[in-house]
Structure formats: structure tokens, C-alpha cells
Interface confidence: low
């Protein structure tokens, strides 16, 4: 991570920033992320991490913003519009939809701070909710009516 | 949230603590969490939030610790050992397992701070990784061998 100035007075800067820096961590699973032989395929593997064995498989897409804390976030991206057959691991079943599970994560953006009379006083951290997709889930489609 | 003292010098205390307080938010889905008529049942609903429409349905369990930031975390708990049939929404298919997706979230615990000569100086925040289950995912079982 690059080092940012903060609005927290200098003596507290490291504390505040260290806490922030580590307060969220990337989503990818705890299992060692072995390279998937078919990272982009709409199929459910019989080995590998959870996201490749799921019948609603997904990949993780890195979202990097050096003006945001955390700078690195990961978004799940579904590899199939529907769910994959448990039997074959490949055929899709349109009776099930592969839907993203979303989470509103708090992030902080660095913005210029302005002191008295609009003078630039380094950077402040601005809190924002940021929508992150955590995983893809096989669901029964909603019944309309 | 109750207000905690912090190790950040007093002028920076609010900043540091506010940032921390909001740096992670509970996981439950963005959709309004209407009470499920069968909250504990192993079935995939055709309406309601994602966790009840999933063929690997789950409920959220509150984990509250007033000495931790965030004080409230939610853990997913699978309602079925296997996946539910997309056709019926009820029968289980033993060809699929309902597995928890885990995430190592950083949390902060308040611990007594000790100043010079061991004198008590309020509370400090201690960073820890804390395992949280985000959702249940229908996966093909691992092939052993």
C-alpha cells in the first residue's frame, strides 16, 4: 500500500491509517487459490476452490483504486446465467438462475482537505458505501404475479 | 454502538474510531429481509430474499460482541446438508453439497492499554482476523483420489 496523509493529527496518523488499511480484506476464499484450468468456463469442477466447484460458478475480478481504502476489492462475476447440472457439471438448467449475492461494504476515499479560507490541508478520508458482489448463488427464479 | 476510548491521541480519537466503526458492515442481503414463513426449513422458496430462494438455503445468525468492532457480525448457517431440487424446491439431491463460503474478516478487539509502569491508560484496539461465513453455496462434491 502507498502511504497516505490523513486528517487525523500527525501523532495519530499511523494508528488511524493502519486500522483503516486492515479493516477490510479481499474476499477470495480461504482455500489456496490454485489456478483454475478453465477459469472462464461455465462448468462446475470436481476439485479446486469453492467458486469453481459451485453449480453457480464465479470468478473474482480485482477492483483496484489507489485513492480508496481498501485499495483492492474483489467482485464475484458469475460464469453462467443459469445453474449447472450436478450430474454432468456442464449442462445448464434454465430452471435455476445464477444470481450475485451483494454486500454494501464501507470504503474510504481520499479527498483533498481544505483548511481555513480554502487552503489545501492534505487529504481527508470520506466514507462511502460501496456495493461488492461476494459470490454467485443458484436460486429458484422469483414467481411473478 | 457504545463509545470506546482509543489509543489514538484524543484529538484524533473520533476520526480513528468513526472510521473503524464504519469500516465493516453486516453481511445480510440488500433485499428487504422479509420474515420467512419457514425460516428453518430445508426448502428453496420461489420468493423472498436470496438466502431463502437459494437451492443451498441459509439463515443468518447474529454474533454480537460489545468488545469488538464491528460489534455485530452475521454468520450464514446452511439449512440443508445437500442441495435442493430446482424442480420441487424441497427434495434434496445428494449429488450436491451445500457448503459454507468463508471469509477472513479483520475485526478489532478492545483491550486495556497500559502506560508507563503498567498504569491503565484506557482501551486499545487489537486487530484480529475473524472467520465469517458469508453464504451457502451448492457445489459438486470433491473427487477424492
Amino acid at each position: 500500500y502507498s502511504h497516505w496523509p490523513s486528517c487525523c493529527p500527525s501523532k495519530g496518523q499511523d494508528t488511524s491509517e493502519e486500522l483503516l488499511r486492515w479493516s477490510t480484506v479481499p474476499v477470495p476464499p480461504l482455500e489456496p487459490a490454485r489456478p483454475n484450468r478453465h477459469p472462464e468456463s461455465c462448468r462446475a469442477s470436481e476439485d479446486g476452490p469453492l467458486n469453481s466447484r459451485a453449480i453457480s460458478p464465479w470468478r473474482y475480478e480485482l477492483d483496484r483504486d489507489l485513492n480508496r481504502l481498501p485499495q483492492d476489492l474483489y467482485h464475484a462475476r458469475c460464469l453462467c446465467p443459469h445453474c449447472v447440472s450436478l450430474q454432468t457439471g456442464s449442462h445448464m438448467d434454465p430452471r435455476g438462475n445464477s444470481e450475485l449475492l451483494y454486500h454494501n461494504q464501507t470504503v474510504f476515499y481520499r479527498r483533498p482537505c481544505h483548511g481555513e479560507k480554502g487552503t489545501h490541508k492534505g487529504y481527508c478520508l470520506e466514507r462511502r458505501l460501496y456495493r461488492v458482489s461476494l459470490a454467485c448463488v443458484c436460486v429458484r427464479p422469483r414467481v411473478m404475479g | 454502538y457504545s463509545h470506546w476510548p482509543s489509543c489514538c491521541p484524543s484529538k484524533g480519537q473520533d476520526t480513528s474510531e468513526e472510521l473503524l466503526r464504519w469500516s465493516t458492515v453486516p453481511v445480510p442481503p440488500l433485499e428487504p429481509a422479509r420474515p420467512n414463513r419457514h425460516p428453518e426449513s430445508c426448502r428453496a422458496s420461489e420468493d423472498g430474499p436470496l438466502n431463502s430462494r437459494a437451492i443451498s438455503p441459509w439463515r443468518y445468525e447474529l454474533d454480537r460482541d460489545l468488545n469488538r468492532l464491528p460489534q455485530d457480525l452475521y454468520h450464514a448457517r446452511c439449512l440443508c446438508p445437500h442441495c435442493v431440487s430446482l424442480q420441487t424446491g424441497s427434495h434434496m439431491d445428494p449429488r450436491g453439497n451445500s457448503e459454507l463460503l468463508y471469509h477472513n474478516q479483520t475485526v478489532f478487539y478492545r483491550r486495556p492499554c497500559h502506560g508507563e509502569k503498567g498504569t491503565h491508560k484506557g482501551y486499545c484496539l487489537e486487530r484480529r482476523l475473524y472467520r465469517v461465513s458469508l453464504a451457502c453455496v451448492c457445489v459438486r462434491p470433491r473427487v477424492m483420489g
Partner: antibody
Framework: EVQLVESGAEVKKPGASVKVSCKAS????????MNWVRQAPGQRLEWMGL????????SYNQNFKGRVTLTVDTSASTAYLELNSLRSEDTGVYYC???????????????WGQGTLVTVS | DIQMTQSPSSLSASVGDRVTITCSAS??????LNWYQQKPGKVPKLLIY???SLHSGVPSRFSGSGSGTDFTLTISSLQPEDVATYYC?????????FGQGTKLEIK
């Protein structure tokens, strides 16, 4: 031997309701969904909906605008179709049909009842 | 709703002929298609499920093929007992829908 036996022919006035029964035997009634299909004279088959006897879960064809209600009596291994606000165009043969499936690839109506003729006039 | 269109609406062929009936879906349905046979005055019977799988007891002269939006039912050598109306049906999404039927007669 799998058998689906439907109730007898009905003659109804417009605006009335009709309830058709379908008694199943020769298989585990709760293990298969039951479909209802209509065939108006000289017309194509028209799917009305299905019910899962295991939990009462239903899926309806919205083209019937909420006039259809599907129910089951698992203790009697019988499925029921009720159609309300009858009109002349509802005249036709109503079939119950068991749906076989493998959970993931095929869903097919493998056994059909003999049909119930409903006349609205 | 997914519209299913069969062609031809009716056809006449001789015993021993190879007969082909097509079914077209208004949108892609993968292989989620069944074929039914309905003889005059009788109940529909399942013939082929999942595009190409023959239902038990169905003669091997019947076969099915296709994927996506275009499907075919073929009778390799027409027999007198094959006189019937044939319907395709999609189960890709609710509501299930049937084709308008193809009436097959013997010349």
C-alpha cells in the same frame, strides 16, 4: 402399474366453477409433481400449472389470470384442479399428467389421466 | 412466454417414408424440449424427452435432434400406427408451452 384416474365429465354455466380430481396409484404420489393440461376442441395443448404434492408448492400459467387453483390430498393420493369464473372458451378436455424428472436435465409428462371433458354453456 | 411453432401443420406420407417434423422456439431453450404423440381420440403420450432421449417403449424409428431454437422429430420409416398429431413442448421456463401440433396422415 402407474395410473391416473380423473373424475367424470362436467357441464357448467358461465361464471360457475369446476373442480376436477385425479387419483394416482402405482407410485409414490409425493415424489412427483403433477401437471394439468387443457385441450380445447381443435386447439393445441395448453399447460395450466403444476403442484408438488410433497410441499404443496405450485407454479401457475399466468394466462389463466388467477382463475386456477391446484391442490392435493396426499392421504388420498389425489390432485385437484379448480377453475373459476368459467366462460365458453374454457370448454375442453382437462388432463392431469405426472411429471418425471432427474432434477437437472429432463422434466417430462410421462403418465397422463384419461381426461375430463368440461363443457361450459 | 416462449412461443413454439411447428411445421408443417399437417402432412401426408406413405408407409415406409422418412418423415420430418420441425419445431421452432421463439428464444433459446437449450435442449429442454419434449415430443408427444396423440392418436385420434386418445390421450397424449410421451415420445421423446430432452430433445433426443427415447421414452421407454417407443420404437427406435423415432428420433429427435436439435438445440437452441430449432428441433426436429424424425420417423425413419413411417408405419400405419404412427397416424397421430405430434406436439413439441418446451420446459426451459414457466409457463410450459406446446407447439400447435402436426397432424400426420397416411397417403
Amino acid at each position: 402399474e402407474v395410473q391416473l384416474v380423473e373424475s367424470g365429465a362436467e357441464v357448467k354455466k358461465p361464471g360457475a366453477s369446476v373442480k376436477v380430481s385425479c387419483k394416482a396409484s402405482g407410485y409414490s404420489f409425493s415424489g412427483y409433481t403433477m401437471n394439468w393440461v387443457r385441450q380445447a376442441p381443435g386447439q393445441r395443448l395448453e399447460w395450466m400449472g403444476l403442484i408438488n404434492p410433497y410441499n404443496g408448492g405450485t407454479s401457475y400459467n399466468q394466462n389463466f389470470k388467477g382463475r386456477v387453483t391446484l391442490t392435493v390430498d396426499t392421504s388420498a393420493s389425489t390432485a385437484y384442479l379448480e377453475l373459476n369464473s368459467l366462460r365458453s372458451e374454457d370448454t375442453g378436455v382437462y388432463y392431469c399428467a405426472r411429471e418425471d424428472f432427474d432434477s437437472w436435465t429432463f422434466f417430462a409428462m410421462d403418465y397422463w389421466g384419461q381426461g375430463t371433458l368440461v363443457t361450459v354453456s | 412466454d416462449i412461443q413454439m411453432t411447428q411445421s408443417p401443420s399437417s402432412l401426408s406420407a406413405s408407409v415406409g417414408d422418412r418423415v420430418t417434423i420441425t419445431c421452432s422456439a421463439s428464444q433459446g431453450i437449450a435442449s429442454f424440449l419434449n415430443w408427444y404423440q396423440q392418436k385420434p381420440g386418445k390421450v397424449p403420450k410421451l415420445l421423446i424427452y430432452y430433445t433426443s432421449s427415447l421414452h421407454s417403449g417407443v420404437p427406435s424409428r423415432f428420433s429427435g435432434s436439435g438445440s437452441g431454437t430449432d428441433f426436429t422429430l424424425t420417423i425413419s420409416s413411417l408405419q400405419p400406427e404412427d397416424v397421430a398429431t405430434y406436439y413439441c413442448q418446451q420446459y426451459s421456463s414457466f409457463p410450459y408451452t406446446f407447439g400447435q401440433g402436426t397432424k400426420l396422415e397416411i397417403k
